[in-house]
């Protein structure tokens, strides 16, 4: 008995209805009188809904669940959950017992969008350069807990002196309040972005304050949030910047780049000079820009093995560090298509179509479709092998029974570059040979 549920969580908005899909493969001669179907909470084993003795035994879960009775005989054991609440979030197990038995768990992820943030300042008048101001960003009634990001007018993240609190109301929805304490500069725009990590929904607001600049003492080390994507063989810049104090000189600077996981030294600057690359002589700093706070690292002739996290550590009197991710990528070649057998093909023949694409990274996603764009998922076998440089060759095999005529397309997608390489083959109803003879 095969019990199948979706691999990915089912995402449902608070107050809407959700379907937890579950299917099984009924044996020939199966009747509903033989069926035991139990939905229960995976962790506590609390009964949610059941079908037994040939009939729906109803909801044991706040009367908000229902089966699809007309579909049960075909093996559809899905559960409808009405008026979803935050408290419903979690794993539900679908257990099917006929003679054989099996179960599978499906996750329900509940979500609610956050409101547009409101911004308040304290103090909110007579602001002068050098004043410390508290900016509060508030957003309401979201779920799950939000991610809150602050940035300045240039889009540079502001991470220091941020306090974020999230409080759940009686329905389990969160109100988020994030407080940024800043010393006012010459002028500045401060933006608050409240992100719902499940819905990937961003709600943002900003405030602009315009007094004069006044210096701050702490070292702020900033790197890009998103991974740096670099093509194999090209050069990559891992950006890192810090905020030098007034009167700062390079003699005071310790800059260390290292691999985040192993702490292996990559490159360093200390005692007033560049100490050079400790990483295959493929790294360099930007010496002319260091005094302005640019601690970026240049990595030359990027290889697959370079992929990972690099930490930029800056020490003057104060110190700080931040990690930047390097994501390596290589585009896949245009797929080549082969047929087996490749001659005297007739309708009804079973043919093996192989789609091959080479030297890409990371592993590809392969999709097959027919001439109408309908996905072909059955009888597909895909293998990916890495060469000594870590680049993948992908071979995907589709077995089809030939119709009167047909076009079969293979799409090889690089998930990082979002680059699609495709090939297709058209087979006509007449006896034919592939590739077509000139």
């Amino acid at each position: 008995l095969e019990v199948q549920v979706p691999e990915d969580p089912v995402v449902a908005l608070v107050g809407t209805d959700a379907t937890l899909c579950c299917s099984f493969s009924p044996e020939p001669g199966f009747s509903l009188a033989q069926l035991n179907l139990i939905w229960q909470l995976t962790d506590t084993k609390q009964l949610v809904h059941s079908f037994a003795e040939g009939q729906d035994q109803g909801s044991a879960y706040a009367n908000r669940t229902a089966l699809f009775p007309d579909l049960l005989a075909q093996g559809n054991a899905s559960l409808r959950l009405q008026r979803v609440r935050v408290a419903d979030e979690g794993s539900f197990t679908c257990f099917v017992s006929i003679r054989d038995f099996g179960s599978a768990a499906v996750s329900l992820q509940v979500a609610a969008p956050y409101s547009k943030p409101s911004m308040t300042l304290e103090p909110n008048k007579d602001l002068r350069p050098g004043d410390t101001v508290t900016i509060t960003c508030s957003s309401y009634q979201g779920y799950p807990e939000a991610e809150v990001f602050w940035q300045d007018g240039q889009g540079v993240p502001l991470t220091g002196n941020v306090t974020t609190s999230q409080m759940a109301n009686e329905q389990g929805l969160f109100d988020v309040h994030s407080i940024l304490r800043v010393v006012l500069g010459a002028n500045g725009t401060y933006s608050c972005l409240v992100r719902n990590p499940v819905l990937q929904q961003d709600a943002h607001s900003s405030v602009t304050i315009t007094p004069q600049r006044s210096p701050t003492g702490a070292v702020e080390v900033q790197v890009p949030e998103d991974p740096v994507v670099a093509l194999v063989g090209t050069d990559a810049t891992l950006r890192c910047s810090f905020s030098p104090e007034p009167g700062f000189s390079l003699a005071q600077l310790n800059l260390i780049w290292q691999l985040t996981d192993t702490k292996q030294l990559v490159h360093s600057f200390t005692e007033g000079r560049d100490q050079g690359s400790a990483y295959a002589n493929r790294t360099a700093l930007f010496p002319d820009l260091l005094a302005q706070g640019n601690a970026s690292l240049r990595l030359q002739r990027v290889r697959v093995a370079d992929e990972g996290s690099f930490t930029c550590f800056v020490s003057i009197r104060d110190f700080g560090s931040a990690a930047v991710s390097l994501q390596v990528a290589a585009p896949y070649s245009k797929p080549s298509m082969t047929l087996e057998p490749n001659k005297d093909l007739r309708p009804g023949d079973t043919v093996t179509i192989t789609c091959s694409s080479y030297r890409g990274y990371p592993e590809a996603e392969v999709f097959w479709q027919d001439g109408q764009g309908v996905p072909l998922t059955g009888n597909v076998t895909t293998s990916q092998m890495a060469n000594e440089q870590g680049l993948f060759d992908v071979h995907s095999v589709l077995r089809v029974v030939l119709g009167a005529n047909g076009t079969y397309s293979c799409l090889v997608r690089n998930p990082v570059l979002q680059q699609d390489a495709h090939g297709s083959v058209t087979i006509t109803g007449q006896p034919m040979t592939f590739p077509p003879e000139a």
Partner: antibody, heavy 117, light 108 residues
């Protein structure tokens, strides 16, 4: 005629391991779920583990979870129970049983496991 | 997990008597109950399944009834070969499929 024959029992020290086997015949093995049930000396029956016909679903008694592994080889018509980190309280006769329509309709004769130092 | 409470734990009776053994589940098991007979040193033998259905080869003096949480095994006109230990077992839901504690039926 349905036949289930267990083997692999014996004396083992606490913390040791043992693998029980159950040879099945007389029915289409891959179409039936199977269970292991044990009975400590002078005590009642205790369900231990179950595995579906295709081997893709397994279930365990909480007290053996992480220590026992139920598996099957449909090509060999065989059911197995790999037992590790054995404790004195695992001492019992272990039976394999065929699952019918929500019932254990056929049982083996049992194999004895003694955990003692 | 579902608990199965079997009573009595032991019972003395004579040949020709009628005896009743009960089994109570901690929640509704929708008739997903089996009864087994076990003799000393032997493997259990299936008597009834789905609460009321007699297994192949089991004499008709054995019968089962019940629904929901409460189930009963009755033996009419006890025979000498019926003196044994009897167990109920539920098959409702995701395992564990627990047994009752057993009822030892002895000759008076």
């Amino acid at each position: 005629e349905v036949q289930l024959v267990e083997s692999g029992g014996g004396l083992v020290k606490p913390g040791g391991s043992l693998r029980l086997s159950c040879a099945a015949s007389g029915f289409t093995f891959s179409s039936y779920g199977m269970s292991w049930v044990r009975q400590a000396p002078g005590k009642g029956l205790e369900w231990v583990a179950a595995i579906s016909g295709g081997g893709n679903y397994t279930y365990y008694l909480d007290s053996v979870k992480g220590r026992f592994t139920i598996s099957r080889d449909n090509a060999k018509n065989s059911l197995y129970l790999q037992m590790s980190s054995l404790r004195a309280e695992d001492t019992a006769v272990y039976y394999c049983a065929r699952q019918g329509l929500r019932v254990m309709d056929n049982w083996g004769q049992g194999t004895s496991v003694t955990v003692s130092s | 997990d579902i608990q199965m409470t079997q009573s009595p734990s032991s019972l003395s009776a004579s040949v020709g008597d009628r005896v009743t053994i009960t089994c109570r589940a901690s929640e509704n098991i929708y008739s997903n109950l089996a009864w087994y007979q076990q003799k000393q040193g032997k493997a259990p033998k299936l008597l009834l399944y789905a609460a009321t259905n007699l297994a192949d080869g089991v004499p008709s003096r054995f019968s089962g009834s019940g629904s929901g949480t409460d189930y009963t095994l009755k033996i009419n006109s006890l025979q000498p070969e019926d003196f044994a230990t009897y167990y109920c077992q539920h098959f409702w839901g995701i395992p564990p499929w627990t047994f009752g504690g057993g009822t030892k039926l002895e000759i008076k």
